[in-house]
Interface confidence: low
Amino acid sequence: MALPTARPLLGSCGTPALGSLLFLLFSLGWVQPSRTLAGETGQEAAPLDGVLANPPNISSLSPRQLLGFPCAEVSGLSTERVRELAVALAQKNVKLSTEQLRCLAHRLSEPPEDLDALPLDLLLFLNPDAFSGPQACTRFFSRITKANVDLLPRGAPERQRLLPAALACWGVRGSLLSEADVRALGGLACDLPGRFVAESAEVLLPRLVSCPGPLDQDQQEAARAALQGGGPPYGPPSTWSVSTMDALRGLLPVLGQPIIRSIPQGIVAAWRQRSSRDPSWRQPERTILRPRFRREVEKTACPSGKKAREIDESLIFYKKWELEACVDAALLATQMDRVNAIPFTYEQLDVLKHKLDELYPQGYPESVIQHLGYLFLKMSPEDIRKWNVTSLETLKALLEVNKGHEMSPQVATLIDRFVKGRGQLDKDTLDTLTAFYPGYLCSLSPEELSSVPPSSIWAVRPQDLDTCDPRQLDVLYPKARLAFQNMNGSEYFVKIQSFLGGAPTEDLKALSQQNVSMDLATFMKLRTDAVLPLTVAEVQKLLGPHVEGLKAEERHRPVRDWILRQRQDDLDTLGLGLQGGIPNGYLVLDLSMQEALSGTPCLLGPGPVLTVLALLLASTLA
């Protein structure tokens, strides 16, 4: 017998399948496997080019040998041979393409008796009308329940004819289904039109949750209405818990704003927190074997019906690529004010930022910046340097986002841009900055502080100066003195008090004449060199009733240093038991260079201190 010439064949999807006429295997049994090729589903197909004396037993062949047969070759086989092939494919659990299944089904012209022996998915392609009797249809649809209905697209004729036949077989009249009906329908339940969803929500909604493909418009509307109605099994959205959200996850994309707004907010927050951090929760995307670039290209198109018409809560259920594809950047920019109220995950915020970056490569306009909200936390200092922020409202809005946290590099950059834009640290700005960051003022260098106008000092609160060092107070005190100059004594002291760490001796002397009753905390923050020249009487007047506190502080600066400069008998007049003053009969001469140059005596400063004992006897003096 002459062998036909081998020629390359195309299997389904146009991929090279077998390099030989595989029908020889099935009809004549003349060929044997030798070398292997990779099949499109990842299983290996083996071309057959040996010659056998006797036709083989198909069931003895390996899955590798059974894979990838082209339809054209099956059409030449007898019905019996086709049935034998189908059974072998089932036994070996060989995964077939839609094209191959359709082809086999076509050749099984008579309804097979042994449905259980055939590949499950093959049944989807058989005509259900061939199983019309109650027993036959029950047997047929019981098997169909276990098949992967999604091999067929929703619009495929084979799929469209299955649901009505299944409903008829199970004796379903009208749109009311029992739990058993839904179970019996298997994957076909995902095709039930909206009227079934409306009437059988209790048993159908839990099934729709796990439908792999998106629901059609009719089903979505019915599901939304049923969920909003608050009937079983989920109850009113206002009572939903995290486990309800988990149970509903496949239906979350169909929830409208009214439903989302009535779910307890803490529950949405808790659920999103968990679902965004727990990758094991997420439903695995169905694996489709296709080249990577094809998948990426497909993801750039927004799925039908998902184009965002406004920025609202429904977007929290979009995957990242859907946000990228379905949210228009210009729409996002005009509705930025809504983003802050929507619980996007950090990953989703990344996508939104990317969209804005593409729309505004030179930096965002202030209208967008003002409404960034939590998206501000996604900005880098480099992003912020591109901005021109002039409105105090914008500054406040962004500082609010970072409230309660340390000043971040982003915030520091934002403030720097804002202040530089204004040219000086005016009162309103200072007021705002110190409200958010009480230590802000003390983080500036003396040079930067010199640009603060005296009028801005009115915004400074005592706590804003807590961390300032003497160099900074030296700059701020003269400004404060100028700012408060028109106030009367007691009011003036209240305002100037927290700046006194920068006050010179003469101002402290002046204050001592005004009965101000300075507290010890303020006194302890005064410059040591400003306190040293004060007399005991002046300190007593300055502190008023608080003078008693000196005893507790006698070992701390500036009190310690001041005591060393006072005559002991002067200190004794205070009646506080202060010790360490200059004893009677001693004269202290400070011969330091510092005094020679500045005129300021510095008992403990650098330079030699000469203490001379002078016998101050009247007779000697005489």
């Epitope: 009572t239 939903w240 818990s241 307890p264 907010q265 803490g266 529950i267 949405v268 927050a269 808790a270 999103r272 927190q273 809560e313 929290i316 802050n340 109220a341 929507i342 619980p343 939590y374 309660g404």
Partner: nanobody
């Protein structure tokens, strides 16, 4: 301005219990969901409990389910976290949080809980 102040943290032996309290003040009312996060050294923040405003709807992750109980007293503006059967892995700084626009946007300063023998 919303302020949340936690208390009740400390050192406890494995198997022991602690009750954390959180006092809410400022421009807040009882209509917000509240919760507790924790952050162990070198790890991210983890939500360990949440409770809704006017109902007993609560949330716990599997790691603390059955051991931790969150409750609130709206009148006193207090939220509590009762922690039983404490384990070494519960050692963390615990933060009280208040919901803000579907997210837990307001945070306390945190209180340290150390479980060690």
């Amino acid at each position: 301005e919303v302020q949340l102040v936690e208390s009740g943290g400390g050192l406890v032996q494995p198997g022991g219990s602690l009750r954390l309290s959180c006092a809410a003040s400022g421009s807040t009312s009882g209509i917000y969901a509240m919760g507790w996060f924790r952050q162990a050294p070198g790890k991210g923040r983890e939500l360990v409990a949440a409770i809704n405003s006017f109902s007993d709807i609560t949330y716990y992750p599997d790691s603390v389910e059955g051991r931790f109980t969150i409750s609130r007293d709206n009148a006193k503006r207090m939220v509590y976290l009762q922690m039983n059967s404490l384990r070494a892995e519960d050692t963390a700084v615990y933060y009280c949080v208040r919901e803000r626009g579907y997210n837990f946007g307001y945070w306390g300063q945190g209180t340290q809980v150390t479980v060690s023998s």
